[in-house]
């Protein structure tokens, strides 16, 4: 079925939201971010088998062409469909400031 | 450099727009599309090395975490940043109809 949510590869193997714990050092942010000290990064990881969570017509085309020309056309890729905002306390020239980043944490995922 | 357009892997190896010629049969559209008979499908293909065409903060995080945990976190993926519309002449219950698809042909690409 188009845009299906059933993973034919087995539970948890297909494109879905994962959480990865990362320190400011891991992210390369230690020199400009004060808080939070650790981030639960939500990201989209997993395989995109035929029509699984296909984002749009382009993803459906990509699936078809990947099946025909796997060496030329890659399979669709698991990427964020939307994001949650995150507020950082960051260093500025004048001190510190709150800054909202709208594109930092994945909220849900699809294949494209 | 962040969001850089220089490909460190060599010309044409990094995320960019490619054109793949496909017939209606290739796309699985022969039973519902009358025209065009052949589509020049523009799609995003190529590697996403560190910070190359990083779409947003999430892509930058993904690059950092992939470097640290390559078995857990995949590298960013080359996907459409925007689309060109395409008009299909398609079969309907009552005959034929023109239909515009806004999400069919990639216009430009980024890494996410």
């Amino acid at each position: 079925a188009r845009n299906g949510d059933h993973c034919p590869l087995g539970p948890g193997r297909c494109c879905r939201l994962h959480t990865v714990r990362a320190s400011l050092e891991d992210l390369g942010w230690a020199d400009w971010v004060l808080s939070p000290r650790e981030v639960q990064v939500t990201m989209c990881i997993g395989a995109c088998p035929s029509q699984f969570r296909a984002a749009n017509m382009h993803a459906q085309i990509k699936t078809s062409l990947h099946r025909l020309k796997p060496d030329t056309v890659p399979a669709p890729c698991c990427v964020p469909a939307s994001y949650n905002p995150m507020v950082l306390i960051q260093k500025t020239d004048t001190g510190v400031s709150l800054q909202t980043y709208d594109d930092l944490l994945a909220k849900d995922c699809h294949c494209i | 450099a962040r969001n850089g357009d220089h490909c460190p892997l060599g010309p044409g190896r990094c995320c960019r727009l490619h054109t793949v010629r496909a017939s209606l049969e290739d796309l699985g559209w022969a039973d519902w599309v009358l025209s065009p008979r052949e589509v020049q499908v523009t799609m995003c293909i190529g590697a996403c090395p560190s910070q190359f065409r990083a779409a947003n903060m999430h892509a930058q995080i993904k690059t950092s975490l992939h470097r640290l945990k390559p078995d857990t976190v995949p590298a960013p993926c080359c996907v459409p940043a925007s689309y060109n519309p395409m008009v299909l002449i398609q079969k309907t219950d009552t005959g034929v109809s023109l239909q515009t698809y806004d999400d069919l042909l990639a216009k430009d690409c980024h890494c996410i």
Epitope: L34, S35, P36, R37, N84, P85, M86, V87, L88, I89, T92, D93, T94, G95, V96, S97, L98, Q99, T100, L105 | -
Partner: antibody, heavy 121, light 110 residues
Amino acid sequence: EVQLLESGGGLVQPGGSLRLSCAVSGFSLSSYDMTWVRQAPGKGLEWIGIISGSGSTYYASWAKGRFTISKDSSKNTVYLQMNSLRAEDTAVYFCARGILVYADYGDHNLWGQGTLVTVSS
Amino acid sequence: DIVMTQSPATLSVSPGERATLSCQASEDIYTNLAWFQQKPGQPPRLLIYAASTLASGIPARFSGSGSGTEFTLTISSLQSEDFAVYYCLGVYTYISAEGAFGQGTKVEIK
């Protein structure tokens, strides 16, 4: 000299609205976050919210919906718009520079003297 | 919502003695914490920021410690001018940002 001066306080009836101003001098509002804090008579301090240098706003959950922080950088003024006022909103309202839990470079302690808002019929 | 809880509500101490004030956060706020002193009719005065950094012009008898959810303000040897109300302020950031003061600790002469 760096200064903050609140104004706009006074007597207002329950259900009414009031806009407080915090005029700043000696620094640019585009470079600093600004915090509003209030204190009811004989009570403790209460954090209301912040407007960042870039203009993003953050509020205490109890203030969301009724209180709005804004600024006019050209007038060097931060505002606190208060709607649907209740007797329990009676307090001295302070503005302060920065997010307070981390000091700005330079002056570490910059608060206005406060303006009294009384909500009563 | 972040909640900051201070204890004790009142602390009776003799001049020259040590005073220890506690502040607990309902969320992990890392070091996003400040301590303020307030006297009647005055705005609050910043003593400690980033949980443990002494603000400029503040005597070294004041010190702060802690991280995460548990914080302490210590006044090593109370002077007469130190009798006042002390507040902690925490700021929690993640998907949004919110601050909250503790209810205050009154340090009075024993």
